[in-house]
Interface confidence: medium
């Protein structure tokens, strides 16, 4: 079976002018997934991202996250790239509100 992830992108201010953007993937199966931040359409290097473990979420599916720190005002340059079981998608940083996107099967 394949269950596509729900992808959710959120922002939180960490200091003046700087924000942490977090991309969460949840409720997916199987557990293999690629989740990475892109800037200007290119994957960020590993040393500028933090990843969470891929963990079971209690429903027979999995969840994980990736975060990076960016400067306020450059949100439009960043997208979260997800690849899972042959499906892939890009998810922008929301402007002012949380964005929840269901990947297509």
């Amino acid at each position: 079976r394949t269950v596509p992830p729900m992808v959710n992108v959120t922002c939180s201010e960490v200091s003046e002018g700087n924000i942490t953007v977090t991309c969460r993937a949840s409720s997916f199966y199987p557990r293999n997934i690629t989740l990475t931040w892109r800037q200007d359409g290119v994957s960020l290097s590993h040393n500028t991202q933090q990843w969470g473990d891929v963990l079971p979420d209690g429903n027979g599916t999995y969840q994980t996250w990736v975060a990076t720190r960016i400067r306020q005002g450059e949100e439009q340059r960043f997208t979260c790239y997800m690849e899972h079981s042959g499906n892939h998608g890009t998810h922008p940083v929301p402007s002012g509100k949380v964005l929840v996107l269901q990947s297509q099967r």
């Epitope: 960490v14 200091s15 002018g17 700087n18 892109r38 800037q39 200007d40 359409g41 290119v42 994957s43 960020l44 290097s45 590993h46 040393n47 500028t48 990076t68 720190r69 960016i70 400067r71 450059e74 340059r77």
Partner: antibody
Framework: QVQLVESGGGLVKPGGSLRLSCAAS????????MSWIRQAPGKGLEWVSY????????YYADSVKGRFTISRDNAKNSLYLQMNSLRAEDTAVYYC??????????????WGQGTLVTVSS | DIVMTQSPLSLPVTPGEPASISCRSS???????????LYWFLQKPGQSPQILIY???NLASGVPDRFSGSGSGTAFTLKISRVEAEDVGVYYC?????????FGPGTKLEIK
């Protein structure tokens, strides 16, 4: 080894058009962003345009915005710069460069030999 | 746009002696990811530019270790510990933090 070969330069009248090409080899072209940089005769370097690996992110210098169009054909390992409404101040050697700054690497680590564009009546 | 300045614009050096080039930016190039997006290039006579230093202080592949880069958010220095004849050319700093990317005017290093 990595090779970038520009072509398409030449003499053109003000208001005319040219299309520059950059043929890439020796690396997986579709994985990398690319940029065009130019250098007027006897002058310094000026960044012109950027395109992401998939062509979904494109940026231009203000001096060429609305006149120049960057594009790529990943199947042909080629980068292009369509230049319209050319002006005398566009006269320069145009270089194509790789842009690998997000791969734990760095930007502009490979440059072509350049192609000269001369805009004159 | 971020404005880049360099000094000196001309630098005559005796082979074997050290050399230092200064670069300044009108805005801090320190990103919140702690990388500083300042690059150094050398353009030898009749050649395309080549990268020397990336992200302020990292030596690019194949570049001799007599070159080094340092600095803070807005003030940067390229040092050559012992200049050799092959080091002649024009040295450019460039900010790669935000669009449009901008270069300094260049510093011409020549052998005395």
């Amino acid at each position: 080894q990595v090779q970038l070969v520009e072509s398409g330069g030449g003499l053109v009248k003000p208001g005319g058009s040219l299309r520059l090409s950059c043929a890439a080899s020796g690396f997986t072209f579709s994985n990398y962003a690319m940029s065009w940089i130019r250098q007027a005769p006897g002058k310094g370097l000026e960044w012109v345009s950027y395109i992401s690996p998939g062509g979904d992110y494109i940026y231009y210098a203000d001096s060429v915005k609305g006149r120049f169009t960057i594009s790529r054909d990943n199947a042909k390992n080629s980068l292009y710069l369509q230049m319209n409404s050319l002006r005398a101040e566009d006269t320069a050697v145009y270089y194509c460069t790789t842009d690998r700054r997000h791969y734990g690497s760095y930007a502009m680590d490979y440059w072509g030999q350049g192609t000269l564009v001369t805009v004159s009546s | 746009d971020i404005v880049m300045t360099q000094s000196p614009l001309s630098l005559p050096v005796t082979p074997g002696e050290p050399a230092s080039i200064s670069c300044r930016s009108s805005k801090s190039l320190l990103h919140s990811n702690l990388n500083t997006y300042l690059y150094w290039f050398l353009q030898k006579p009749g050649q395309s530019p080549q990268i020397l230093i990336y992200r302020m202080s990292n030596l690019a592949s194949g570049v001799p270790d007599r070159f080094s880069g340092s600095g803070s958010g807005t003030a940067f220095t390229l040092k050559i510990s012992r200049v050799e004849a092959e080091d002649v050319g024009v040295y450019y700093c460039m900010q790669h933090l935000e669009y449009p990317f901008t270069f300094g005017p260049g510093t011409k290093l020549e052998i005395k």
